[in-house]
Interface confidence: low
């Protein structure tokens, strides 16, 4: 995506979304290469804000402050033209985060979805944000922006993502901006991992010594498959978090992970999924559900479901 004949292409690395105090490299690509260039900030009426400085290849801007947020353009060096400079580049919006309290990010119906389904990511805050921005980790393109809805002292926006495909899986964060400062964003929400299931064949799940055990007896759940999964994920119905283990190749050419549950106290329905290291947020079909029953248990109450940890890091690699 380069500029036109006499139009440079301005880009930002690693992202156009920069934390306050961070750095960003602005690159001006002109005529099949990086030449000398000049930078402009649009809200200064095209007057160079960099004291007439000329840059080569890239300019590292930072540590950034809220004042750095805005729209930038560059002009490439063109010695034989009347002005000595090319036409202005594409506009590039730099957004600076960390200027307001972080919003909250929720997934409806939940963060674990089947391929082809649609998820609503709701970003909300008691700060009266005018706009909300949704950004997927590792994506250099601009975040998606929606106008906030204000109701009963809460501002929110619903981002509809789908039909879900592997490319849409990953770690999402949202930000808010207040009126009249559209590119000065809040601190990021806690990360939310969107996981897509149903892409690969289901693993099998079994229990040792068996699916019905005595209270206090040690239970291990084994997830295995002929597919060379790198990681297995074990979930229990009613619990919001999952456990994960690295898959181990077995002599019989299957790939297996053994989840020790410890002394049995409560039963439950379990499922497992497989995934590959390269796509940690894209999981297999669910195994058939496995009901683990505990006999001789004086208490039939379940532990209260735990909230998913914001640092769950499902979409980060297991090292």
């Amino acid at each position: 995506l380069m500029g036109g004949q006499d139009k440079p292409f301005l880009s930002a690395r690693p992202s156009t979304v920069v934390p306050r105090g961070g750095h960003v490299a602005l690159q001006c690509h002109y005529r099949r290469g990086f030449n000398n260039f000049m930078l402009y900030k649009e809200d200064r009426s095209h007057v160079p804000i960099f004291h007439g400085r000329i840059f080569q290849e890239s300019f590292i801007m930072g540590p950034v402050t809220p004042a750095h947020a805005g729209t930038y353009r560059c002009r490439g060096s063109r010695p034989h033209s009347l002005t000595g400079w090319s036409a202005p580049s594409n506009p590039l919006v730099i957004m600076v985060t960390g200027n307001h309290r972080k919003p909250s990010l929720l997934a409806h119906p939940g963060p674990l979805l089947k391929s082809g389904e649609t998820v609503i990511l709701q970003c909300w805050s008691d700060v009266m944000f005018e706009h909300f921005f949704l950004h997927r980790e590792g994506i250099s393109e601009d975040p998606s922006r929606l106008v906030g809805q204000i109701h009963d002292g809460v501002s929110k926006a619903n981002f509809s993502i789908g039909p879900l495909m592997p490319v849409l899986a990953g770690t999402y964060r949202c930000y808010g901006s207040v009126p009249h400062s559209p590119y000065q964003l809040s601190a990021p929400s806690d990360p939310l991992d969107i996981v897509i299931t149903g892409l690969y064949e289901k693993p099998s799940l079994s229990a040792q010594p068996g699916p019905t055990v005595q209270a206090g007896e040690n239970v291990t759940l084994s997830c295995s498959s002929w597919s060379s999964y790198d990681i297995y994920h074990l979930s229990r119905e009613g619990e919001a978090h999952e456990r994960r283990l690295r898959a181990v190749p077995k002599v019989n050419r299957t790939f297996q992970a053994d989840f020790p549950l410890g002394p049995a106290t409560h039963g439950g329905t379990y499922r497992c999924f497989g995934s590959f290291r390269a796509l940690p947020c894209v999981w297999s079909n669910s195994s058939d559900p496995l009901l683990v029953s505990v006999t001789g248990n004086p208490s039939s109450s379940w532990p209260s479901p735990t909230e998913p940890s914001s640092k769950s890091g499902i979409c980060r690699h297991l090292h």
Epitope: T118, I120, M128, E130, S144, R145, L146, V147, Q149, I150, H151, D152, N158, F159, S160, I161, G162, P179, H180
Partner: antibody
Framework: QVQLVQSGAEVKKPGASVKVSCKAS????????MHWVRQAPGQGLEWIGY????????ENNRKFKDKTTMTADTSTSTAYMELSSLRSEDTAVYYC?????????????WGQGTTVTVSS | DIQMTQSPSSLSASVGDRVTITCRAS??????LAWYQQKQGKAPQLLVY???NLADGVPSRFSGSGSGTQYTLTINSLQPEDFATYYC?????????FGGGTKLEIK
């Protein structure tokens, strides 16, 4: 019930200004953004911009940036749009519309429209 | 800015027919799409929101479908009151552009 009632038709000379009003009733005025849409004779719909009555924040379609000024009076639950430096091509019906709530909201209520005719 | 391309621009049909109007966005708008009906001299009226949801009071012969960049409004068994102009509109960030409109006329 929700109602958006707009001011009556206007005939103006080129170069003049006009202020169109949109009075809201039946809901909390400050809880919804108010948008303006234009329709030239025999043409389609064009989004002009919006105002958030609770903050006064406005956002314009670049095409109309220097043409329109949007304001809101929360005491009377009325949104206004002023069109300046009128030209014949500004002859159109101007609608106000409320952006709804909930999942991926649309314009759920519209005013009846105000016809602005620019003619010398 | 996102462009909305609506087709056809006009359509002749008879009472009882089934008609389909399509709207193509220049980029993925993630179902942030509404359909409106406008009759001569009147304000537009909401038919469908979030691509597939029917607005209150809209007859069930209207339906919306689609995702990504491609969306469709279908009217099953056309009634005399359905002859009007139809517009799509996206809400995936400002400016909220409309499609060019489809004028549905009696054959």
């Amino acid at each position: 019930q929700v109602q958006l009632v707009q001011s009556g038709a206007e005939v103006k000379k080129p170069g003049a200004s006009v202020k169109v009003s949109c009075k809201a009733s039946g809901y909390t005025f400050t809880s919804y953004t108010m948008h303006w849409v234009r329709q030239a004779p025999g043409q389609g719909l064009e989004w002009i911009g919006y105002i958030n009555p609770s903050s006064g924040y406005t956002e314009n379609n670049r095409k109309f940036k220097d043409k329109t000024t949007m304001t809101a009076d929360t005491s009377t639950s009325t949104a206004y749009m002023e069109l300046s430096s009128l030209r014949s091509e500004d002859t159109a019906v101007y609608y106000c519309a409320r952006l709804g709530k909930g999942l991926l909201p649309p314009f759920d209520y519209w005013g009846q429209g105000t016809t602005v005719t620019v003619s010398s | 800015d996102i462009q909305m391309t609506q087709s056809p621009s006009s359509l002749s049909a008879s009472v009882g027919d089934r008609v389909t109007i399509t709207c193509r966005a220049s980029e993925n708008i993630y179902s942030n799409l509404a359909w409106y009906q406008q009759k001569q001299g009147k304000a537009p009226q909401l038919l469908v929101y979030a691509a597939t949801n029917l607005a209150d009071g809209v007859p069930s012969r209207f339906s919306g479908s689609g995702s990504g960049t491609q969306y469709t409004l279908t009217i099953n068994s056309l009634q005399p009151e359905d002859f009007a102009t139809y517009y799509c509109q996206h809400f995936w960030g400002t400016p909220y552009t409309f499609g060019g409109g489809t004028k549905l006329e009696i054959k």
